[in-house]
Interface confidence: medium
Amino acid sequence: LECYSCVQKADDGCSPNKMKTVKCAPGVDVCTEAVGAVETIHGQFSLAVRGCGSGLPGKNDRGLDLHGLLAFIQLQQCAQDRCNAKLNLTSRALDPAGNESAYPPNGVECYSCVGLSREACQGTSPPVVSCYNASDHVYKGCFDGNVTLTAANVTVSLPVRGCVQDEFCTRDGVTGPGFTLSGSCCQGSRCNSDLRNKTYFSPRIPPLVRLPPPEPTTVASTTSVTTSTSAPVRPTSTTKPMPAPTSQTPRQGVEHEASRDEEPRLTGGAAGHQDRSNSGQYPAKGGPQQPHNKGC
């Protein structure tokens, strides 16, 4: 079996110019392509992988929401030579998320990593964005986490930072087929420079206080202390799955056999994000571009 091969990390890795083909190992009988797109209120980007796969032919589309961070995943496996070029992996511009200017800043600022490399998303070096409330959702928390896509024996990962609806989430995550978006939230401007080591204690959960042993001559303290030892588990309702994006049509025939122009975009939306002018077009970044299978 021969499959297309490429890796895209919010760049042009799968653009029309950069396409490669690979011969699969004996016993491998499916080609795979997977795309994961992440949207924050300040932009969007995508990860994508094409290559030799494993498992059965088929499609799996999923939409996810993590405290206002949206993720859209499409996984497609097929059993014909070079059949894994059906999903449109075009990276599109990181446009502002719709009518951004129509919303007044709510006073919170967060570091924003949308399609940035891990090097560019270190500490306080990423750009700072002003959070705003959209569609009756309050974005007053800051998020620091990662998105990971695994397919064709390849794992690609990028950092994600931005404004979210929760200020206290700790190591929360949502998963889809070969896809994970996870991280932590915090309260206060620019608090998301590094939340990798955030513990489960937050202003909502009084910390466990160790009191000195009472001295025989004094009255025991009457301070109320919460001694819960297990970390609270956030209810799953906060990470609700979203409707699956519309299904992808197969590659166009004859005239468009050598064209990607009319392949539909990965689409989807979620409550609170309809205002975004680009919410129905994925992947998004400037990416890449169609990615670059460097065309000739």
């Epitope: 490669k20 070079r82 990607r260 990416g287 890449p288 571009q289 169609q290 000739c296």
Partner: antibody
Framework: EVQLLESGGGLVQPGGSLRLSCAAS????????MSWVRQAPGKGLEWVSY????????YYADSVKGRFTISRDNSKNTLYLQMNSLRAEDTAVYYC??????????WGQGTLVTVSS | QSVLTQPPSASGTPGQRVTISCSGS?????????VHWYQQLPGTAPKLLIY???QRPSGVPDRFSGSKSGTSASLAISGLRSEDEADYYC???????????FGGGTKLTVL
């Protein structure tokens, strides 16, 4: 039917500027990567520049980097190539081409740019 | 000097089979990038003939075929016809140059 129509070529002096246009029709222009490819008289093909569907990513051959700028107006279905600091070696027929499934699958008829004093 | 190397000329008689080679390197064809072939008839714009190593766009006769192996590729034309007289170019992406590269072109003459 897919059509690409270049315009804007002509005679220009060394150091001068020229702006080429490529009007596209018959396909969803805003979804297509586009390129400029040139061919000097009696010579082979040379890729010049390409641009992503949204216009956010641009790439250039080393020979034109810093002098040429590719851009697009998706609302007008038009691709542009702004050429500055032109040199004699930039003399060529400039073709606008659509990038399809990994290849330049549609080409315009070309427009001739002559750089001479 | 082109990044991809093609013979400057080739010839054949009607009905014959002709092969045009295209030699690259580890930064282009050898890196796994797909190879394309273009036909340029005299006085006209290039036309996509073969894409993706061996795929024919609709309208291209099956007399034209492409193949790729290692760092090189080839275009075969069987049942040569007079209207096949043209310049043929191979192309592929090049990692080092971060862009598409073309061969120098092969002028095919039908004797």
């Amino acid at each position: 039917e897919v059509q690409l129509l270049e315009s804007g070529g002509g005679l220009v002096q060394p150091g001068g500027s020229l702006r080429l246009s490529c009007a596209a029709s018959g396909f969803t222009f805003s979804s297509a990567w586009m390129s400029w490819v040139r061919q000097a008289p009696g010579k082979g093909l040379e890729w010049v520049s390409y641009i992503s569907s949204s216009g956010s990513s641009t790439y250039y051959a080393d020979s034109v980097k810093g002098r040429f700028t590719i851009s697009r107006d998706n609302s007008k279905n038009t691709l542009y190539l702004q050429m500055n600091s032109l040199r004699a070696e930039d003399t060529a027929v400039y073709y606008c081409a659509r990038e399809g499934l990994w290849a330049f699958d549609k080409w315009g008829q070309g427009t001739l740019v002559t750089v001479s004093s | 000097q082109s990044v991809l190397t093609q013979p400057p000329s080739a010839s054949g008689t009607p009905g014959q089979r002709v092969t045009i080679s295209c030699s690259g390197s580890s930064s282009n064809i050898g890196a796994g990038y797909v190879v394309h072939w273009y036909q340029q008839l005299p006085g006209t714009a290039p036309k996509l003939l073969i894409y993706d190593n061996n795929q024919r766009p609709s309208g291209v006769p099956d007399r034209f075929s492409g193949s790729k192996s290692g760092t090189s590729a080839s275009l075969a034309i069987s049942g040569l016809r007079s209207e096949d007289e043209a310049d043929y170019y191979c192309a592929a992406f090049d990692d080092r140059l971060s862009g598409p590269v073309f061969g120098g072109g092969t002028k095919l003459t039908v004797l």
